[in-house]
Interface confidence: low
C-alpha cells in the first residue's frame, strides 16, 4: 500500500509540469484533468491554479467555482476551486 501510494504520489507530482506545457502531446492529459476538475470540484494537482501556468489564461473557465458551497479563492481575478485534485485522484485510483 505505502509503495504504491509513493509511486502514485511521485507520478502525480511529476505530471504537474504537464499542466503548464504548451505542446500538442500534453493536451490529452490536460483535457483529462480539466474533466476531473469539473467532476470533483478541485483545481490543479499540487499547487492549485498555479499548476496551470500561462495555460490558465488560455482556458477561459479553468477551475471556475460553479458550486460556491465548496471552498473557493480568487486567482488572477477569477473565483476558482481552492482544493487541489491530488487527494481526489488518489482516492479515485484507490477505488478503481
Amino acid at each position: 500500500k505505502s509503495k504504491s501510494d509513493r509511486i502514485v504520489n511521485e507520478t502525480l507530482y511529476e505530471n504537474t509540469k504537464l499542466l503548464s506545457a504548451t505542446g500538442e502531446s500534453e493536451k490529452q492529459f490536460q483535457e483529462a484533468i480539466i474533466v476531473f476538475q469539473e467532476e470533483f470540484k478541485c483545481c490543479g494537482l499540487v499547487n492549485g491554479a498555479a499548476d496551470w501556468g500561462n495555460n490558465f489564461q488560455h482556458y477561459p473557465e479553468l477551475c471556475a467555482c460553479l458550486d460556491k458551497q465548496r471552498p473557493c479563492q480568487s486567482y488572477n481575478g477569477k473565483q476558482v476551486y481552492k482544493e487541489t485534485c491530488i487527494s481526489f485522484i488518489k482516492d479515485f485510483l484507490a477505488k478503481n
Epitope: 477561459p60 473557465e61 471556475a64 460556491k68 458551497q69
Partner: antibody, heavy 121, light 106 residues
C-alpha cells in the same frame, strides 16, 4: 448592444416535442455561458438550464432533467432548447438569458423578450 | 436546493415614499445574490448583483444590502416607473429565484 431573440414557441400537445432557438447578437457569443429561464402564466421565474461558453458543461433543473436538452452552435451565435415529453406544467414563457461569465456560474445580466410555449390537448 | 423567500408578497407604496423589500435564503449564499425588476409584458431586467452592486445605468435610488441569508432591496423614493415585480435570485449554488414582490401604487 446585446440582443437575444427567441423563437420556436407555440401550442403543442402533451407528450410531444418542441425546439426553441435563441439568436444572439451584440456580444461575443462564444465567450459566455447561456441559460434558459421560464415563467408560467401569472407565476414567478424558474431557472431551467445552463450551458458553458464552449458547450462542454450543461446543468438542468430537476423538473426538466432527462426531458430537455440545452445546446449551442457558436458558429451561428445560436442557443437551443430541445423539449421532449412535454407536460401541461411546462406551459410558460421561455427566456433566453446570458450569464455574466463563460461558465454560466454567476448572475444573469441580459434577457431576451421570451417565447410562449403552451402545452395543451 | 437553496430556497429563496421574499416578503412581503405585495407592497403598497405612494410615489415618493421609500420601499424596502426582503429576501431570505434557506442557507448562506454569501454575497452571490441578484435582484431583477419585471414590468407587465416585459422581460426581467438586472438591477443589483453581488448583493449590493448596481447594474450599469441603474439610478442611485436603488440600493441592495445584506449577505449570508438576509438581503434587502431599498428604493429610496419611488418613481412611477418603479412600480413592478421584483425578484431576488441566488447564484451561490446553481440558481434559484424568490417568488417575487409586487410593488403597487397605494
Amino acid at each position: 448592444q446585446v440582443q437575444l431573440v427567441e423563437s420556436g414557441g407555440g401550442v403543442v400537445q402533451p407528450g410531444r416535442s418542441l425546439r426553441l432557438s435563441c439568436a444572439a447578437s451584440g456580444f461575443t457569443f462564444s465567450s459566455y455561458g447561456m441559460h434558459w429561464v421560464r415563467q408560467a402564466p401569472g407565476k414567478g421565474l424558474e431557472w431551467v438550464a445552463v450551458i458553458w461558453y464552449d458547450g462542454r458543461n450543461k446543468y438542468y433543473a430537476d423538473s426538466v432533467k432527462g426531458r430537455f436538452t440545452i445546446s449551442r452552435d457558436n458558429s451561428k451565435n445560436t442557443l437551443y432548447l430541445q423539449m421532449n415529453s412535454l407536460r401541461a406544467e411546462d406551459t410558460a414563457v421561455y427566456y433566453c438569458t446570458r450569464d455574466h461569465s463563460g461558465s454560466g456560474s454567476y448572475y444573469i445580466d441580459y434577457w431576451g423578450q421570451g417565447t410562449l410555449v403552451t402545452v395543451s390537448s | 436546493e437553496i430556497a429563496m423567500t421574499q416578503s412581503p408578497a405585495t407592497l403598497s407604496v405612494s410615489p415618493g415614499e421609500r420601499a424596502t423589500l426582503s429576501c431570505r435564503a434557506s442557507q448562506s449564499v454569501s454575497s452571490n445574490l441578484a435582484w431583477y425588476q419585471q414590468k407587465p409584458g416585459q422581460a426581467p431586467r438586472l438591477l443589483i448583483y453581488g448583493a449590493s452592486t448596481r447594474a450599469t445605468g441603474l439610478p442611485a435610488r436603488f440600493s441592495g444590502s445584506g449577505s449570508g441569508t438576509e438581503f434587502t432591496l431599498t428604493i429610496s423614493s419611488l418613481q412611477s416607473e418603479d412600480f413592478a415585480v421584483y425578484y431576488c435570485q441566488q447564484y451561490n449554488n446553481f440558481w434559484t429565484f424568490g417568488q417575487g414582490t409586487k410593488v403597487e401604487i397605494k
